[in-house]
Amino acid sequence: AGVFELQIHSFGPGPGGAPRSPYSARGPCRLFFRVCLKPGLSEEAAESPCALGAALSARGPVYTEQPEAPAPDLPLPNGLLQVPFRDAWPGTFSLIIETWREELGDQIGGPAWSLLARVTRRRRLAAGGPWAGDIQRAGAWELRFSYRARCELPAVGTACTRLCRPRSASRCGPGLRPCAPLEDECEAPPVCRAGCSLEHGFCEQPGECRCLEGWTGPLCMVPVSTSSCLGLRGPSSTTTGCLVPGPGPCDGNPCANGGSCSETPGSFECTCPRGFYGLRCEVSGVTCADGPCFNGGLCVGGADPDSAYICHCPPGFQGSNCEKRVDRCSLQPCRNGGLCLDLGHALRCRCRAGFAGPRCEHDLNDCAGRACANGGTCVEGGGAHRCSCALGFGGRDCRERADPCAARPCAHGGRCYAHFSGLVCACAPGYMGARCEFPVHPDGVSALPAAPPGLRPGDPQRYPHHHHHHHH
């Protein structure tokens, strides 16, 4: 157990010019700060709860806004921000500091809050060390602060996991040694035998493993047998070394939220961690005064410890403390493979090539709404579109006049004539076919099946229009 402490030194415009004034000139204001601690160094920290704890500063002195003047360093609240932690100090953590402005005008619903700046930094810090100073930029603002983590006795060490006894103690309990005369505070517990149960064993000398009542074995992992023990709950038998563990009031630990249980005559008592109270530590002691709502959430109720608070979250956030960002893109509003972007104030779709529209719903390559001019027809395929144009027209949309004879379609010297229903080839002597592609044998017999009845070699060959499409 221990306390993380944060001292804000200054908050104001950074070097290189004053930021755009955040002041609204609607009346007096004051600053306050929120600190949020999260374990580890994850980039995802901003979207997770403040698992190590959070705290809210007092309000700073009231100041009057001056929109035209450059923003000076703003007046700060007095005192430290303190975040108690119950378990081990993790060493690596994410530190989030929010600077809030409270407008004290006559707004409906009380003072208006607005977030001026938020800095998020991942840090390594050993408990018990000196104050660490830092300067961080948030946009054009600059925040100067110091922080440290300190253990609360009997916990000591860089992670607050070692326990100690005051030097005045004449005798130590399980796992604790008297403090050495020359040691500043206390001495670490001895190293027990390897494998000695952390829950049921302890040692007073290095390398030993002594068992708590009800447990036995070289590593204190074996519950004592009930067959040859005393029938009453009481001290361990000197002959068998075992104990009949009757149904004690602390069995199963009835204390919630990390509370520790101690037996009282005929009952139990829970020692609750900070922030919880009640017979079983089941009631949260957090009130709206503690600022439990993150990301601009509005706290309602909770004026005293006996009433709960409710956080009304702003758009884009959820959770009992508004600590979770709503993944509005999870509904997959963008079609055709578009990328959903959450801009905070709105969602936007970034479309793949070939698609458009607010939700990428328009396929720029399909035939929907695509007119092919001059009697052309739209043909879809392969994620693209093309116009199959009527005779005499070409281009992407069949808007260009096309000369059907421009490609010299008549073979072997045949002459091409444009015709309203298609092109016509007049073949040179000795050739026949729609494009004059077939030679005529000297005996007048075609090398291919005979010409249709009534068609003599040398007659013009009409090229039906349905064979002639310009594809672009």
Epitope: A46, E47, G344, R352, A353
Partner: antibody
Framework: QLQLQESGPGLVKPSETLSLTCTVS??????????WGWIRQPPGKGLEWIGS???????YHNPSLKSRVSISVDTSKNQFSLRLSSVTAADTAVYYC?????????????WGQGTLVTVSS | AIQMTQSPSSLSASVGDRVTITCRAS??????LGWYQQKPGKAPELLIY???SLQSGVPSRFSGSGSGTDFTLTISSLQPEDFATYYC?????????FGPGTKVDIK
């Protein structure tokens, strides 16, 4: 401080496959707030976006290169990779990897220092 | 694909000058445009995002404006370290496309 570092061979033969890896340090590649992109710059010329990948594997490519481009991600190693097949001299460039923020406002805020890949026999 | 054009392609200026670079998109891109500075042998660095938002740590002499198809990067008072090539990037639609660049050198 986030850092990106490109690595891979500096010389590739024509018609072969160019392979590069970008290693991300100082931050997690598995964040939901970022895409991870590849951009290239031929000597003396401008910048061209190649493609981007999300930690879950969702990919966007530049259609001008799509048939030749493959981008993959390895979250366990905090890396993402680029493969460009059938390379020609026109693929000679400095290749950069970069992080693109996709929440709030979109932009490439962190870049690797770049690695020159020459395509030559 | 959305085409981006920049003008001028190069310019010569002196320390203390006010410099303006323009970027034009072939279709409307709202304000989804960034400006990047690149020095020889270095990776590009973000200056402005969302057309007008100054990236943290970038000097306030840099500013951006515009929306739709026409955008401007302004350096209010050119400093020696500002001689570089500047690129605009549209991130409105895929494929993301850069402008051809504007080289700012010493007069």
């Amino acid at each position: 401080q986030l850092q990106l570092q490109e690595s891979g061979p500096g010389l590739v033969k024509p018609s072969e496959t160019l392979s590069l890896t970008c290693t991300v340090s100082g931050g997690s590649i598995s964040s939901s707030s970022y895409y991870w992109g590849w951009i290239r710059q031929p000597p003396g010329k401008g910048l061209e976006w190649i493609g981007s990948i999300y930690y879950s594997g969702n990919i966007y490519h530049n259609p001008s290169l799509k048939s030749r481009v493959s981008i993959s991600v390895d979250t366990s190693k905090n890396q993402f990779s680029l493969r460009l097949s059938s390379v020609t001299a026109a693929d000679t460039a400095v290749y950069y990897c970069a992080r693109e923020i996709i929440v709030g406002a979109t932009h490439f805020d962190y870049w690797g220092q770049g690695t020159l890949v020459t395509v030559s026999s | 694909a959305i085409q981006m054009t920049q003008s001028p392609s190069s310019l010569s200026a002196s320390v203390g000058d006010r410099v303006t670079i323009t970027c034009r998109a072939s279709q409307g891109i709202r304000n989804d445009l960034g400006w990047y500075q690149q020095k020889p042998g270095k990776a590009p660095e973000l200056l402005i995002y969302a057309a007008s938002s100054l990236q943290s740590g970038v000097p306030s002499r840099f500013s951006g404006s515009g929306s739709g198809t026409d955008f401007t990067l302004t350096i209010s008072s050119l400093q020696p370290e500002d001689f570089a090539t500047y690129y605009c990037l549209q991130d409105y639609n895929y494929p993301l496309t850069f402008g051809p660049g504007t080289k700012v050198d010493i007069k």
